[in-house]
Interface confidence: medium
């Protein structure tokens, strides 16, 4: 079995985590790819998606997560801004290929969010800010039904992360397994 | 085989600004992650922050944060560091360096792989 | 931020000699660390990365090991390009941290 390992993002509250997952180009670049919290014991439960198929470059944002799909660098861009405590977390991103399971992209990220802004180690200010002036998308992404029970063989180190968008139309404190994305006009 | 080149050296007064340049040739450019370093004399290696082209989004070292300008070109394949305020403190070699993840990561999974020549840049009245 | 504290920091050595590079973490890191060389007036060389793993066109007399917090690089058989400075990195979470560094020099 291939190592899960995680990498760390230690980042104040109101910064954006900014992460890259990167991909096979050929084989998924046009596959729908999705952003994953993982709680202790849990099948992983799904935040945000991309459309299906997967769109170039076009941002998808669920409340406080937006997705970019870089098809010509094979790589989904994962923004989650104005960072909460209540982020902290462990997440990952996946890649669905029905009816196969999804598929892991790695490293998992271990989030740790705590108060009081400072403008290091994630993006600076500027780039938090820039980053509600992405043009929001007009289209509904569905997120499948379903998540791989694979992904939960060995249970992750605990976290209590709930995602909330208090400023956002989704919240997404109680999570299901299915989330739709919301027109935003 | 990626190389990156580093703009020439520079002599500056305290309080003033400088640029130092960092031109990638050869691979890809946009998706790694190029970091800048520095070295004072006889001193060890000091991370000041970083850069995905792609992204256009930088990450600092506290230590810089308030000084430090890192920005990309991604027509030009170069990145740039620009530190403002300086001091006879800031007297160092600067450094850029790439790497790559192949994980959902902003920073390097191979270290630091490739590096540039330096630019050494000094600060003095 | 992460500490790294690299000892010796200084050390003499032969040629043909086993010499050893300790490295540690403030703390866990799993695995995300690197090891360079650097010579006077040069820029750093990459070794190691991923704590143990060797980078292309490195001679397989480096070695890495370790995990967590504690961390060594080892060269088996110290050659005569091999004086030089040492540093350790970890790349686990931002800002990225170096070690002070290992000079090692010709006995």
């Known amino acids: 079995a291939t190592k899960l390992t995680e990498e760390k993002y230690e980042l104040k509250e109101g910064q954006t985590l900014d992460v890259k997952c990167d991909y096979t180009l050929e084989k998924f670049a046009s596959s729908q790819k999705a952003w994953q919290i993982i709680r202790d014991g849990e099948m992983p439960k799904t935040l945000a998606c991309t459309e299906r198929p997967s769109k170039n470059s076009h941002p998808v944002q669920v409340g406080r997560i937006i997705l970019e799909d870089y098809h010509d660098h094979g790589l989904l861009r994962v923004r989650m801004v104005n960072l909460q405590v209540e982020d902290s977390g462990l997440y990952q991103c996946v890649i669905y290929q029905p009816p196969k399971e999804p598929h892991m992209l790695f490293d998992r990220i271990r989030l740790v969010v705590t108060k009081g802004f400072s403008g290091t180690p994630g993006s600076n200010e500027n780039s938090t800010q820039n980053v509600y002036k992405i043009p929001p998308t007009t289209t509904k992404a569905l997120c499948p039904l379903y998540t791989s029970p694979r992904t939960v063989t060995q249970a992750p180190p605990k976290s209590t992360a709930d995602v909330s968008t208090p400023d956002s139309e989704i919240n997404l404190t109680n999570v299901t397994d299915i989330i739709r994305v919301p027109v935003f006009n | 085989q990626v190389q990156l080149v580093q703009s020439g050296a520079e002599v500056k007064k305290p309080g003033s600004s400088v640029k130092v340049s960092c031109k990638a040739s050869?691979?890809?450019?946009?998706?790694?992650?190029i970091s800048w370093v520095r070295q004072a004399p006889g001193q060890g290696l000091e991370w000041m922050g970083g850069i995905i082209p792609l992204f256009g989004t930088a990450n600092y070292a506290q230590q810089f944060q308030d000084r430090v300008t890192i920005t990309a070109d991604e027509s030009t394949r170069t990145a740039y560091m620009e530190l403002n305020s300086l001091k006879s403190e800031d007297t160092a070699v600067y450094y850029c360096a790439r790497g790559h993840g192949p994980g959902s990561s902003h920073y390097s999974y191979y270290g630091l792989d490739v590096w540039g020549q330096g630019t050494t840049v000094t600060v003095s009245s | 931020d992460i500490q790294m504290t690299q000892s010796p920091t200084s050390l003499s050595a032969s040629v043909g000699d086993r010499v050893t590079i300790t490295c540690r973490a403030s703390?866990?890191?799993?695995?995300?660390l690197a090891w360079y060389q650097q010579k006077p007036g040069k820029a750093p060389k990459s070794l190691i990365y991923a704590a143990s793993s060797l980078q292309s066109g490195v001679p397989s007399r480096f070695s890495g090991s370790g995990s967590g917090t504690d961390f060594t690089l080892t060269i088996s058989s110290l050659q005569p390009e091999d004086f030089a400075t040492y540093y350790c990195?970890?790349?686990?979470?931002?800002?990225?941290?170096f070690g002070g560094g290992t000079k090692v020099e010709i006995k």
């Open positions: 990195q970890q790349y686990n979470s931002y800002p990225l941290t």
């Open positions: 050869g691979g890809t450019f946009s998706i790694y992650v």
């Open positions: 703390q866990g890191i799993s695995s995300w």
